[in-house]
Interface confidence: low
């Protein structure tokens, strides 16, 4: 349907406040540099003019596309070529070459500090104050921190954001209320973050087929009721949200969700008996209930596999008619009776399953080729299940600090020439997967794991992507999507690998370590074994283990003197001088 | 980084045949999807036909479906493009484009192809 005002169309459809918010996270996503006060004034600015054509979808400029209003109203920033370099030399071009401009300058990692939280007092009076610029804030915040950072889901927790608030700021003790809250949702917020930086990288990297590919596996498990054409219905519709999001077209995004949700709802019949409680919410928190749905009962009555896909004697040429559709129902009746399966050990599957209908099907015998393919499954499915294992034991005897420690070790050893930063974010990151998933039934702990652990490996290719340094991690990281974990779990020792120069100013530590909270003196401790593996690389475990040992010890007794600042002077060298010599 | 160069266009009539090849640099060939697009004058760049990296699954328009053939020489580190039945509507640049990373299949989207050769210009004419 076309429509005679796309910015009226989308306002009237998403309501006064959705649009509001989502053009202040659009704006904060291109354009992170900038104080909350433009965005917010860019985002009044380019609501009344939404409601203006509203109200006449034949004013001034009202025809326009979202991309050239956004576009135009983005190159009216003063302080664009300050602030932003050669970004500014988007403004010169024309759509929809300007927008693939702004999308290509969006920072992944724009260096901003963590988000400290004011005393609890000093918050509540803000959110009192003045609600909506209150819950705008966050939404600047989060959109400026995560540039591809799902939109309408970045709603939904601003409007959790605001439950928080209204809660806690009647309580008797504020912090107390707000502190494990806030942390609860900050933690979600990440997660949120990294999973939706997966799926636009899926999309840009690997191509629609990637991302449709991976959501039949996700939404055949979740709801193995549904038929494939269902999950077909409602993977398309996925991929086109996703795609909006991920190409900055938030409003376009959030609307076409809204109506996936209200497709999902009427049709929950031929769906899943599980989103009965979903579809009486209201849009925002629909949605979000729908992506997090629990798991429908398996049908009792599914056939054997082999019967449609080895047995059948037009295997191929049910295959050849038709690649796709065939791979898809392939990947969907898998999918759906293998809920314990992670998705991309299912993408595995079906990428074996196709390999192998290549190869036979250009054969004089076909079915006598691909009679064994599903034993021949057998090792990918054996290799993330014993991953998870031999892991899921590690964690449980280190903990999840020694067990970040040991999977920086092996990174580092994997990929020295990564930034330290990187690889202690990553390892930091990675190592969560433990306390995550290990604790988890045996029958949800692969998926657990491998899924979690390609959001994270997503964050690793995506950092790199920005400063390729070494060619292994770019061969892992562009090869295959599915198999990046094996990639990245089967590197070796880069035997390559030139160690680094001895820096003493990389090991000199200050008083100011022990007012830090816990977390950030574990992000100091391990950024020195990183740097210290960086110039031994051969160093041993046990050799690490004694060093690390020694740097806590230090930092305790200097923690606990009096003059802290002269112990760390005076203790640092000392113990730098036994490092070295117990590295030799 | 891949670079891609094209030959074996020309001037050729209707019903005849022509062989374009596209030798490729810095990658090897079969660790990538690549593809032959063409632009006729005044129209939109369009898919013609495209092999996938890894698995030889390949793809071709409708428009050239029986009549073109594409195929790669791993050797050689080149793709070809056997063009058959040649019709006056196929005048046009052909391009070879890449996209690295082993991707099972080709797309005919021509925007995620990061690599392209300069192109070589196909007439069909009496």
């Known amino acids: 349907e076309a429509y005679k005002s796309e910015i009226a169309h989308r306002y009237n459809d998403l309501g006064e406040e959705h649009f509001r918010g989502l053009v202040l996270v659009a704006f904060s996503q291109y354009l992170q540099q900038c104080p909350f006060e433009d965005h917010v004034k860019l985002a009044k600015e380019v609501t009344e003019f939404a409601k203006a054509c509203a109200a006449e979808e034949s004013g001034a400029n009202c025809d326009k596309s979202l991309h050239t209003l956004f576009g135009d109203k983005l190159c009216t920033v003063a302080s664009l070529r300050d602030k932003y370099g050669d970004m500014a030399d988007c403004c010169e071009k024309q759509e929809p070459d300007r927008n693939e401009c702004f999308l290509a300058h969006k920072d992944d990692n724009p260096g901003f500090p963590p988000l400290v939280a004011p005393e609890p007092d000093a918050l509540c009076a803000a959110f009192q104050d003045n609600e909506q610029l209150f819950l705008g804030k966050y939404l600047y915040e989060i959109a400026r921190r995560h540039p591809y950072f799902y939109a309408p889901e970045l709603l939904y927790y601003a409007q959790q954001y605001k439950g928080v608030f209204a809660e806690c700021c009647q309580a008797a003790d504020k912090a107390a209320c707000l502190g494990p809250k806030i942390e609860a949702l900050r933690e979600k917020v990440l997660l949120s973050s990294a999973k939706e930086r997966f799926k636009c990288a899926s999309l840009q990297k690997f191509g629609d087929r990637a991302f449709k590919a991976w959501s039949v596996a996700r939404l055949s498990q979740r709801f193995p009721k549904a038929d494939f054409a269902e999950i077909s219905k409602v993977v398309t519709d996925l991929t086109k949200v996703h795609k909006e999001c991920c190409h900055g077209d938030l409003l376009e995004c959030a609307d076409d969700r809204a109506d996936l949700a209200k497709y999902m709802c009427e049709n929950q019949d031929s769906i899943s008996t599980k989103l009965k409680e979903c579809c009486d919410k209201p849009v925002l928190e629909k949605s979000q209930c729908l992506a997090e749905v629990e798991r429908d009962e398996l049908p009792g009555d599914l056939p054997s596999l082999a019967a449609d896909f080895v047995e059948d004697k037009e295997v191929c040429k049910n295959y050849q008619e038709a690649k796709d559709v065939f791979l898809g129902t392939f990947l969907y009746e898998y999918a759906r009776r293998h809920p314990e399966y992670s998705v991309s050990l299912l993408l595995r599957l079906a990428k074996e399953y196709e390999a192998t209908l290549e190869k036979c099907c250009a054969t004089d015998d076909p079915p006598t080729c691909y009679a064994k393919v599903l034993d021949e499954f057998k090792p990918l499915v054996d290799e993330p299940q014993n991953l998870v294992k031999t892991n899921c034991e590690l964690f449980e005897k280190l903990g999840e600090y020694g067990f970040q420690n040991a999977l920086l070790v092996r990174y580092t050893k994997k990929a020295p020439q990564v930034s330290t930063p990187t690889l202690v974010e990553v390892s930091r990151k990675l190592g969560k997967v433990g306390t995550k998933c290990c604790k988890k039934p045996e029958s949800e702990r692969m998926s657990c794991a491998e899924d979690f652990l390609s959001v994270v490996l997503n964050r690793l290719c995506v950092l790199h992507e920005k400063t390729p340094v070494s060619e292994r991690v770019t061969k892992c990281c562009s090869e295959s999507l599915v198999n990046r974990r094996p990639c990245f779990s089967g590197l070796e020792v880069d035997e390559t690998y030139v160690p680094k120069e001895f820096n003493a100013e990389t090991f000199t530590f200050h008083a100011d370590l022990c007012t830090l909270p816990e977390a950030e003196k574990q992000v100091k401790k391990q950024t020195a074994l990183v740097e210290l593996l960086k110039h031994k690389p051969k160093a041993t475990d046990e050799q690490l283990k004694t060093v690390m040992g020694d740097f806590g010890a230090f930092v305790e007794k200097c923690c606990a003197a009096e003059n802290k600042e002269g112990c760390f002077s005076e203790e640092g060298p000392k113990l730098v001088a036994a490092a070295q010599a117990a590295l030799v | 980084e891949v670079q891609l160069l094209e030959s074996g266009g020309g001037l050729v009539q209707p019903g005849g045949s022509l062989r374009l090849s596209c030798a490729a640099s810095g990658r090897y060939i079969d660790e990538t999807a690549v593809a032959w697009f063409r632009q006729a004058p005044g129209k939109e760049r369009e898919f013609v036909a495209g092999?996938?990296?890894?698995?030889?699954?390949?793809y071709y328009a409708d428009s050239v479906k029986g009549r073109f053939t594409i195929s790669r020489d791993n050797s050689k580190n080149t793709l070809y493009l056997q063009m058959n039945s040649l019709r006056p509507e196929d005048t046009a640049v052909y391009y070879c484009?890449?996209?690295?990373?082993?991707?099972?299949?080709?797309?005919?989207?021509?925007?995620?192809?990061?690599?392209w050769g300069q192109g070589t210009l196909v007439t069909v004419s009496s």
């Open positions: 092999i996938g990296g890894g698995v030889d699954i390949t």
């Open positions: 484009a890449a996209r690295p990373g082993k991707p099972l299949i080709t797309s005919k989207v021509a925007d995620l192809y990061p690599y």
